[in-house]
């Protein structure tokens, strides 16, 4: 059967019917419904929301909707013993304490179960000592402190500003520097855009607002107690001492009012340069310790949070494919929030809900997709991508054989300026073609395509007339599908103007002020950007599930492989003498990339010419496309990161949010000049070039004629 036989509607009309059914007013209504109370992972409220979504997806017309539960390690503050930080005098008296909770937003004063700001998975402890200001706590910040300024963080409590990199990397860096505690704070330089009022009068962060978040270094492991396997009823759990990725020192987040009180007394070294200064009226001295008059005062942390094995619930909906039911296209986004989740995640969950409703409407009219579509509402994303990872671990054998694509659906907006897409190169042409067919919601682009406004506002740095598409990193639920299983993945959302807004993320991220009103009043009153994101995400899912030939272009992978090979070669060539001494050659990698390019080109020619009415040949060609992403997976994983198995892309070792290309080679080269054993270090570079070259060549061969 062709997909047209399965549908009774022409393919063009299918897509139009699906897109026309998506309504901004519905997304608005769903967002309101999902944001009236907190939905923290592991709580009764989030279980009830899971059951509501299950019920509604069934009403919308999905074939089946099931809850998948797991018992995973979560972390909560102690309700009777709050976390806080003090300045103590020489007698040990607390002369200043940080806040115990955020001032609630208007209209939410009587809402119960708002979790106070905390760093999830922080160990308990009450360390006291001198403070050292470490800027963003990036790898380069600690290099500056330790190597250039000769400042020792050992035994100190460090204070770092949020932004630039994932908070878990900051904590890892502080631990490695010997710190005994970490204070994270939001500096107005990063979380207060000039000319905008703070919430509730605008979308900026008030001084009492605080960013929550986990501080794990899981490297794709999922539940810290069951790495590699689902946290099911018969799971064997590690002891807490063997758990994956837990921090070893207490950590706590604060807002900028509290940070002002800690930083204004700082003495010691002056900041090394202006890039270490934020926007508070403080000197940004590095320390260690307080200045003259206050030198006998210390900082003390009081952290009493507990780690608890808790049940979480994913909602998994199925719309069975008419022709290839054993091929899965997955649309997934999380449901759990830190508090109200006005943007993260419910702006995404509301879009997923409307996409499900639209697909359900078509199904009720007799239509089915060619391939099966799976819809997922993930739990415990905020605690380390746990729900998605456990489900993927439980279903890994099915997914690696049947998974066509995964489209992520967390926050639909982080701004209202232009589109932002991160995806596998296989999806570049799909995204380009789709956005050319969609209308731009942007002011000044009436009657123009989304492709046009996106390209104008966010041009590709390499190719003129094309929009920027970024590499996938991590920090969201696509991680297990892409980085571990090698399933082609993508994500799309509306974003800010990165050139004019230099703050990190959006100001109210993970704070109590991320409410429905934030979105409705300040970001997207007409919900037109939400609708556009629904059209992009839904349109991608539709095409991936319904096109006769999978909408993947392997030639785009060839282009980026060459670019990434050039880039990593340039990095290595910063050490020409050592490359000569240790006979380091990239010839094998460039040769493999050349072979890949030629084979991909020939495959694409065959793809144009083959007989699409022959179901066996069609399935064969589609399988070659589907399995291409899988071919970049190394079963042994990256060094010390067994669950990051993609050889072309991995989350940066220095920032989980960012993607790194040829990560094995990149990490082997990183800071190589400081390695104690250069011979061993350059040997590892050579090994990583070998692994990369082999993998690219092996992937190329999957596109060759089968016999």
């Amino acid at each position: 059967k062709s997909s047209n036989e399965a549908t009774n509607i022409t393919p063009k009309h299918n897509m139009k019917a699906f897109l026309d059914e998506l309504k901004a007013e519905n997304i608005k209504k769903f967002l309101y419904n999902f944001t009236q109370i907190p939905h923290l992972a592991g709580t009764e409220q989030n279980f009830q929301l899971a059951k509501q979504i299950q019920s509604q997806w069934k009403e919308f017309g999905l074939d089946s909707v099931e809850l998948a539960h797991y018992d995973v390690l979560l972390s909560y503050p102690n309700k009777t013993h709050p976390n806080y930080i003090s300045i103590i005098n020489e007698d040990g008296n607390e002369i200043f304490n940080t806040s115990l909770f955020e001032p609630p937003p208007p209209g939410y004063e009587n809402v119960s179960d708002i979790v106070p700001p905390f760093s999830a998975f922080s160990p308990q402890g009450m360390p006291e000592g001198d403070l050292v200001y470490v800027n963003y706590a990036r790898t380069e910040d600690f290099f500056k402190l330790e190597r250039d300024m000769k400042i020792n963080c050992s035994g100190k409590i460090v204070i770092a500003r949020y932004g630039k990199v994932f908070r878990g990397n900051k904590v890892k860096n502080a631990q490695l520097a010997g710190a005994k505690g970490v204070i994270l704070y939001s500096d107005p330089a990063d979380y207060f855009a000039p000319g905008v009022k703070s919430y509730p009068d605008g979308w900026n962060l008030p001084g009492g607002g605080v960013q929550r978040g986990n501080i794990l270094n899981l490297n794709g492991a999922g539940d810290p107690l069951t790495p590699g396997y689902p946290a099911n009823e018969y799971a064997y759990r590690r002891g807490i001492a063997e758990a994956v990725g837990l921090p070893s020192i207490p950590v706590h987040p604060i807002g900028y009012y509290d940070a002002q009180k800690l930083l204004e007394k700082m003495g010691g070294s002056a900041p090394p340069d202006s890039s270490w200064r934020g926007s508070l009226k403080v000197p940004y001295n590095v320390g260690p310790g307080f200045t003259g008059n206050f030198s006998t005062q210390k900082v003390k942390m009081h952290i009493h949070s507990t780690n608890e094995v808790t049940r979480i619930y994913n909602v998994i909906g199925t719309l069975r494919g008419a022709v290839e039911p054993d091929r899965y296209v997955i649309l997934g986004g999380h449901r759990d929030s830190w508090v109200f989740g006005g943007i993260d995640p419910q702006s995404g969950a509301a879009v997923v809900h409307e996409i499900v409703r639209s697909f359900g409407t078509l199904k009720k009219e007799g239509w089915r997709p060619r391939r099966t579509i799976l819809f997922a509402s993930w739990d415990a994303e905020e605690f380390g991508l746990l729900g998605s990872t456990e489900w993927a671990e439980e279903n890994s054998r099915l997914l690696q054989e049947r998974g066509v694509a995964y489209i992520n659906a967390d926050s639909s907006i982080e701004g209202n300026y232009t589109l932002r897409v991160d995806c596998t190169p296989l999806m570049y042409s799909l995204v380009h073609n789709l956005t050319k067919e969609l209308k731009s919601p942007d002011e000044g682009f009436e009657g123009k395509s989304l492709y046009e406004s996106w390209t104008k506002k966010s041009p590709s740095p390499e190719f003129s007339g094309m929009p920027r598409i970024s590499k996938l990193g991590s920090g969201n639920d696509f991680e297990v599908f892409f980085q571990r299983l090698g399933i082609a993945s993508g994500r799309a959302r509306y974003t800010k103007n990165w050139e004019t807004n230099k703050f990190s993320g959006y100001p109210l991220y993970h704070s109590v002020y991320e409410t429905y009103e934030l979105v409705e009043k300040f970001y997207d009153p007409m919900f037109k950007y939400h609708l556009t994101v629904a059209q992009v995400r839904g349109g991608m899912v539709f095409e991936l599930a319904n096109s006769i030939v999978l909408p993947f272009d392997c030639r785009d992978y060839a282009v980026v492989l060459r670019k990434y090979a050039d880039k990593i070669y340039s990095i290595s060539m910063k050490h020409p003498q050592e490359m000569k001494t240790y006979s380091v050659s990239f010839d094998s990698l460039f040769s493999a990339v050349k072979n890949f390019t030629e084979i991909a080109s020939k495959f694409s020619e065959r793809l144009q010419d083959f007989d699409k009415s022959n179901p066996i040949v069609l399935r064969m060609m589609n399988d070659q496309l589907m399995f291409l992403e899988r071919a970049f997976i190394d079963p042994l994983g990256l060094p010390d990161r067994p669950f990051y198995r993609h050889v072309i892309y991995a989350p940066s070792s220095h920032n989980k949010y960012a993607g790194e290309s040829f990560p094995g080679i990149y990490d082997a080269l990183f800071d190589i000049e400081s390695k104690v054993d250069p011979s061993k270090a350059w040997g590892e570079v050579k090994r990583q070039i070998y692994v990369a070259a082999f993998t690219v060549q092996a992937a190329a061969e999957t596109l060759s004629e089968v016999a």
Epitope: T98, S99, P103, E109, G207, G208
Partner: nanobody, 123 residues
Amino acid sequence: EVQLVESGGGVVQPGRSLRLSCAASGFPLISYGMHWVRQAPGKGLEWVAFMTYDGSNRYYADSVKGRFTISRDNSKNTLYLQMNSLRDEDTALYYCARDRIVGGRVPDAFDIWGQGTMVTVSS
């Protein structure tokens, strides 16, 4: 309408105790730091005490430190001042006032005042 209403004042002997209350209406007490301020007959205003919105910090004037305790019950939208070991010089009209900065961590300026409650310490 936003308002603060003080109560609990009266005549008391030196060395005795008194508890003042301040009922807030028209705004959520939970988001604001709150002050007690007093004005002795024929004198200027004197700041007495401040408590942050969340109760994490309390600040007192040296003249009342160790004798007065500021507290709050956010669920009742009420601020209190427990005054022990009262002295003649504590005689004053006591006002509660709202700090102008939502979520402020230290005493700042006041933006809303009550009408005051009179405390007279006399033997």
